[in-house]
């Protein structure tokens, strides 16, 4: 019951905590279970006991085995077992399952990946992070204290993350690596009253007569997959298809984007060869879903050609 699995790589530091707890002032004795041989407390030894901690500096494959710790409280001798396995370093990039720590899940709101076991070590920044053996670079990744923060998490961020740090013991440095899987979970979706991001209400759009013009209607409807959501343009309160002006067309299909995790739709209105009469029309961007409809109105105004004369 009071047994704990610990693992590490040869030539790296490994520190194991006794699975039985007690106050820092309690004496803790460590033994190598197979031989019942006491683990020394002198720090000059490669493997030594330091209170509730057993330190392998560095670890060797031959250190593998079961270690017994006895916490001597005022009332009881509490016995625990540490099952230690030291593995040879892999030549390739793959981290085998037996070296993986518990999987963590993240989402757009919470994307912290803690470096496993780091609290046992005397480490100093920086903490290095790798994903699938590649060093993480870019502003989306921030190493903060003992964890990695990923901004704007996407499903592609799922994978195996390795943290690497240096443990210092009496001036000597030892490398430590630890790997865990990160999965990205979809946050629960929700729906809200449409929010039109563009155009602004009663916007005046400058156009040049004889040139082409594009108007974009963009709205967001909530988070996750939306059951019913649409954006469209109307001319003088009439659907584009019913208005009967072939120069003015809505872009076929709706472009779905996820801005900041929100489900948003765009619809582009294309006006070819802008004419004077187009300036007299009322252009309505409509966004609708199960909550209702929101309308933003745009009007066109003539853009004065730039006067190049001095």
């Amino acid at each position: 019951k009071f047994s704990k699995q610990s693992w590490g790589l040869e030539n790296e530091a490994l520190i194991v905590r006794c699975p039985r707890q007690g106050k820092p002032s309690y004496t803790v004795d460590w033994y190598y279970s197979q031989t019942n041989k006491s683990i020394p407390t002198q720090e000059r030894n490669r493997v030594f006991a330091s209170g509730q901690l057993l330190k392998f500096l560095p670890a060797a494959v031959a250190d593998s085995g079961i270690y017994t710790c006895i916490v001597r409280s005022p009332t009881f001798n509490r016995t625990g077992y540490a099952n230690v396995t030291i593995y040879k370093k892999q030549s390739d990039c793959n981290v085998p399952d037996y070296l993986m720590y518990s999987t963590v899940s993240g989402s757009e709101k919470n994307s912290k990946i803690y470096c496993p076991t780091i609290d046992l070590y005397n480490w100093t920044a920086p903490l290095e992070w790798f994903k699938n053996c590649q060093a993480l670079q870019g502003s989306r990744y921030r190493a903060h204290k003992s964890f990695l923060v990923i901004d704007n998490v996407m499903t592609e961020d799922a994978g195996d993350y390795t943290c690497k740090f240096i443990h210092n013991e009496n001036g000597a440095n030892y490398s430590v690596t630890a790997t865990r899987s990160f999965t990205v979970k979809d946050e629960q979706g929700f729906s809200l009253f449409p929010v039109i991001g563009a155009p602004a209400q009663n916007e005046i759009k400058e156009v040049e007569i004889g040139k082409n013009a594009n108007l974009t209607c963009s709205a967001c409807f909530g988070k996750g997959t939306q059951f019913l959501a649409a954006v469209l343009w109307q001319l003088n309160g009439t659907k584009i298809t019913d208005f009967g002006e072939p120069r003015i067309q809505q872009e076929e299909g709706q472009n779905q984007s996820f801005s900041n995790g929100l489900a948003c739709l765009d619809m582009v209105l294309r006006i070819a060869d802008v004419k004077e009469e187009d300036l007299l029309l009322q252009y309505d961007c409509l966004a609708l879903n199960l909550h209702g409809l929101r309308r933003h109105t745009v009007r066109l105004s003539r853009k004065n050609p730039i006067d190049h004369h001095s």
Epitope: R20, K23, P74, T75, F76
Partner: antibody, heavy 121, light 106 residues
Framework: QVQLVQSGAEVKKPGASVKVSCKAS????????MYWVRQAPGQGLEWMGA????????AFNQKFKGRVTMTADKSTSTAYMELSSLRSEDTAVYYC??????????????WGQGTMVTVSS | DIQMTQSPSSLSASVGDRVTITCSAS?????MHWYQQKPGKAPKLLIY???KLASGVPSRFSGSGSGTDFTFTISSLQPEDIATYYC?????????FGQGTKLEIK
Amino acid sequence: QVQLVQSGAEVKKPGASVKVSCKASGYTFTDSEMYWVRQAPGQGLEWMGAIDPETGDTAFNQKFKGRVTMTADKSTSTAYMELSSLRSEDTAVYYCTRAFDNDNDDAFAYWGQGTMVTVSS
Amino acid sequence: DIQMTQSPSSLSASVGDRVTITCSASSSVNYMHWYQQKPGKAPKLLIYDTSKLASGVPSRFSGSGSGTDFTFTISSLQPEDIATYYCQQWSSNPLTFGQGTKLEIK
């Protein structure tokens, strides 16, 4: 939440024995040691002993050694304290108590409601 | 056995007063814990490991000290603080409590 519920009050004659029970809930019974403390009327607190429910190991205040027996039933998450050869000075409220946590096993954060044991001829 | 001597054994103070109780151990201890007990109730842990506030305990309670001399303080006495207070050590067997300090309101 952690709860310790003790058995009801007892009246005993001198020389008899009393067995007080303490049913634990809200945590894994075998993960924490159970301690027994008593308090005579108008007096202070006195530690009697402890049991590790996982192993059955016990530890006692020398004052009570030979007279007190502590046991634990893992199947019902219940600890028992039996005090024999009762005398009038054993009249007290008997408490079972559990430590704050295993890192702070010498401070008692959880207490039973107490069992009044009266020893009278 | 380590003997624990609390002083005073009783004290009377007014609401809002700063109240200090001391506990002296007959030999050096690592930690001191403090409990509050109201009539007919089980003791309640207030301070553990000399100075750490137990969960849900108001911040007006505090503890300090080391070695053989320890102090428990209520920064501003409240009517609900009327109780008996005990110190406790377990650096060596047996675990021992102080004899208690009974606190009353003037």
